[in-house]
Interface confidence: low
């Protein structure tokens, strides 16, 4: 598995990561850490593992965290009750 760097699918990344769109170059996907407490997230992000190609630049939140709305268009990873 690729621990970091370019990828195409989640299976090419290490544990605790997903293959997300680069925030710098949209045509490139890179192995990205899953969301930690307080990280920005997107509520429609696919869960790991996803066997297709992601369209988001964020990964889902780590296990035990949920992607929750904090304002009209902002979501962050918060502890699941």
């Amino acid at each position: 598995a690729v621990i970091t760097g370019a990828c195409d699918k989640d299976s090419q990344c290490g544990g605790g990561m997903c293959c997300a769109v680069s925030i710098w170059v949209k045509s490139i996907r890179i192995c990205t850490p899953m969301g930690k407490l307080g990280d920005s997230c997107h509520p429609l992000t696919r869960k790991v593992p996803f066997f297709g190609r992601r369209m988001h630049h964020t990964c889902p939140c780590l296990p035990g965290l949920a992607c929750l709305r904090t304002s009209f268009n902002r979501f962050i990873c918060l502890a699941q009750k």
Epitope: P43, L68, R69, T70, L78, K81
Partner: antibody
Framework: EVQLVQSGAEVKKPGASVKVSCKAS????????MHWVRQAPGQGLEWIGY????????TYNQKFKGRVTITVDKSTSTAYLELSSLRSEDTAVYYC??????????????WGQGTLVTVSS | DIVMTQSPDSLAVSLGERATINCKAS??????????MNWYQQKPGQPPKLLIY???NLESGVPDRFSGSGSGTDFTLTISSLQAEDVAVYYC?????????FGQGTKVEIK
Amino acid sequence: EVQLVQSGAEVKKPGASVKVSCKASGYSFTDYDMHWVRQAPGQGLEWIGYISAYNGATTYNQKFKGRVTITVDKSTSTAYLELSSLRSEDTAVYYCARDGNYGEAYAMDYWGQGTLVTVSS
Amino acid sequence: DIVMTQSPDSLAVSLGERATINCKASQSVDYDGDSYMNWYQQKPGQPPKLLIYAASNLESGVPDRFSGSGSGTDFTLTISSLQAEDVAVYYCQQINEDPFTFGQGTKVEIK
């Protein structure tokens, strides 16, 4: 057993405000969002908005922006809908409905019994 | 806003026969390969009841004679063998973007 119990029927004059309550029980209140939906007599369903019971963040149907306020009181596990500047077209049954937490599908799995709000001069 | 249009407005079906309700969205309600469409049943004097979420997922406790299908803009709720207790109004709802919007409803009756 999950239950959503709403306040009783209201009769209001045009221009007034109404506040409907929805007391939740049988689940962890802050783990679920709460939606409000209304239904005019003999008509279909209209989504008003929803609130995160966890942090109070709201999303409203733009149609009601400026007239609607959704709040929660975590200490009593109660959600509130306040609608101001009432007009006759606001006469409807107002429902609270819990979001089922089905991933990104905002599906309303438990509903209150409804509160009839009548706006009449 | 996404406009949801159901057809037919009403439907009379014999007991044990299949009932099919269609719902068309004014734009796609798909996202990342999933379809953000729910179906509800409402009986007179009662609040709506969730039947299907995310186009094809049966809500817990709902009989398996109910099923949902479709993607993009076209969706279907099917009752494979209509029972007397299925007489109700059925609503589709898109939840792909807010405001979440409902169809106008389809009334299902016994023929």
